[in-house]
């Protein structure tokens, strides 16, 4: 039932753009409109066990389809990647060294908050262009699975799974602080 | 499938709050854009506020600026429009509304049932 | 703060077509403010018929169509049925903040 696993109709990836080795940066101003109204940022582990965790953010840069139309300019989203603890190294009977995680509970990294960035699609023989938002991860978290979460959340999230079941519409996730405006404007 | 099940009709006295409540189900709240509309007997829809994904906060009509809260319990998948300060202009069906996921935001998708708020001495 | 305006009230025979404009207190209407058209019946919940000025919805009628015309945003509806009488109302996003119109009251007969 999730988004994540899924995404927009045939997207286009741009190699060589966007891949950015840091994480975008968080703007921690204060919120203004709505006496900090938005959702608080998600901290699901202590700084301590950081180290214990793999949670990697991802850059990939593409343009974005609507049906006939495209974006006028390549989008840069932010893909969850990576595996996330508590966890610690075994050797298997081969000799290589694999994560194990002994009963415990599973971690998955998966996108904390989101943030929409308005895309201006130009379409085919001569049809007017559209203005659409699109949902774009803003940052990803090592996230304690229950069974209670949907199915969506076992899955990788990355851009070879990013497709659209016929039908359905990709799902959202957490959102938390204002998004960094630079960001916005310059992730092109 | 989003579905929105707000609570039931209040009845309140000029200056009192009221406090409408909205229970996801479905989806999680956290997934969603949750907005607050309300309509007067008679008179048309008038937007209170809502999550804007834009610049990731809550942000209210003028128009109940300082009279209005919205909050989410994500706990309980509930969402919350408190007014304060009640007069009898405030007498309408209050709903809330959401987006419904997706890859293009595509706000206002699913609708609460309605919760009638009557302000009356 | 922004107002937007719609015609109070339109008529339409059945089968034919008739257009349902909307128009800003601040100028032109262009697609950055993603106009929303809403269908609302008596007793009724609002219900979504074009999101982002022409985006169709699954449960929207092939009858029903948005685009921008001379300035406004427009709701066509060509070959009216009775079942379409109900008050329409427009949004316009204004960065984040929304302004619904005041409503059209559509009478088919």
């Known amino acids: 039932q999730g988004w994540q696993a899924f995404r927009n109709d045939a997207t286009e990836v741009i190699p060589g753009l966007g891949e950015y080795p840091e994480p975008p940066p968080e703007n921690n101003q204060t919120m203004n409109r709505a006496e900090n109204g938005g959702r608080p940022p998600h901290h699901p582990y202590d700084a301590k066990d950081v180290s214990e965790y793999s949670c990697r953010e991802l850059h990939y840069t593409r343009f974005l389809t609507d049906g006939p139309c495209r974006s006028a300019k390549p989008v840069t989203e932010l893909v969850c990647s990576g595996q996330c603890g508590p966890a610690r190294l075994l050797p298997n009977a081969i000799g290589r060294v694999k994560w194990w995680r002994p009963n415990g509970p599973d971690f998955r990294c998966i996108p904390d908050r989101y943030r929409a960035q308005r895309v201006q699609l130009l379409c085919p023989g001569g049809a007017a262009p559209r203005s659409r938002k699109v949902r774009l991860v803003a940052s990803c978290k090592c996230k304690r699975l229950t069974r209670f979460h949907n199915q969506s959340e076992l899955k990788d999230f990355g851009p070879e799974t990013a497709r659209p079941q016929k039908g359905r519409k990709p799902r959202p996730g957490a959102r938390g602080a204002k998004a960094n405006q630079a960001e916005l404007e310059n992730a092109y | 499938e989003v579905q929105l099940v707000q609570s039931g009709a209040e009845v309140k006295k000029p200056g009192a709050s009221v406090k409408v409540s909205c229970k996801v189900s479905?989806?999680?709240?956290?997934?969603?854009?949750m907005h607050w509309v309300r309509q007067a007997p008679g008179k048309g829809l008038e937007w209170m506020g809502g999550?804007?994904?834009?610049?990731?906060?809550?942000i209210y009509a003028q128009k109940f600026q300082g009279r209005v809260t919205m909050t989410e319990d994500t706990s309980t998948d509930t969402a919350y429009m408190e007014l304060s300060s009640l007069r009898s202009e405030d007498t309408a069906v209050y709903y809330c509304?959401?987006?419904?996921?997706?890859?293009?935001?595509?706000?206002?998708?699913?609708w609460g049932q309605g919760t009638l708020v009557t302000v009356s001495s | 703060q922004a107002v937007v305006t719609q015609e109070p009230s339109l008529t339409v025979s059945p089968g034919g077509t008739v257009t349902l404009t909307c128009g800003s207190s601040?100028?032109?209407?262009?697609?950055?403010?993603?106009p929303y058209w809403f269908q609302q019946k008596p007793g009724q919940a609002p219900r979504t018929l074009i999101s982002?000025?022409?985006d169709k919805h699954s449960w929207t009628p092939a009858r029903f169509s948005g685009s921008l015309l001379g300035g406004k945003a427009a709701l066509t509806l060509s070959g009216a049925q009775p079942e379409d009488e109900a008050e329409y109302y427009c949004?316009?996003?204004?960065?984040?903040?929304?302004?619904f119109g005041g409503g059209t009251k559509l009478t088919v007969l």
């Open positions: 509304a959401t987006d419904a996921g997706g890859y293009w935001y595509k706000f206002f998708q699913h």
């Open positions: 479905g989806y999680t709240l956290s997934e969603l854009s």
């Open positions: 999550f804007d994904p834009e610049g990731g906060e809550t």
């Open positions: 601040t100028g032109t209407v262009t697609i950055d403010h993603y």
């Open positions: 982002d000025t022409d």
């Open positions: 949004l316009l996003f204004y960065g984040g903040t929304v302004v």
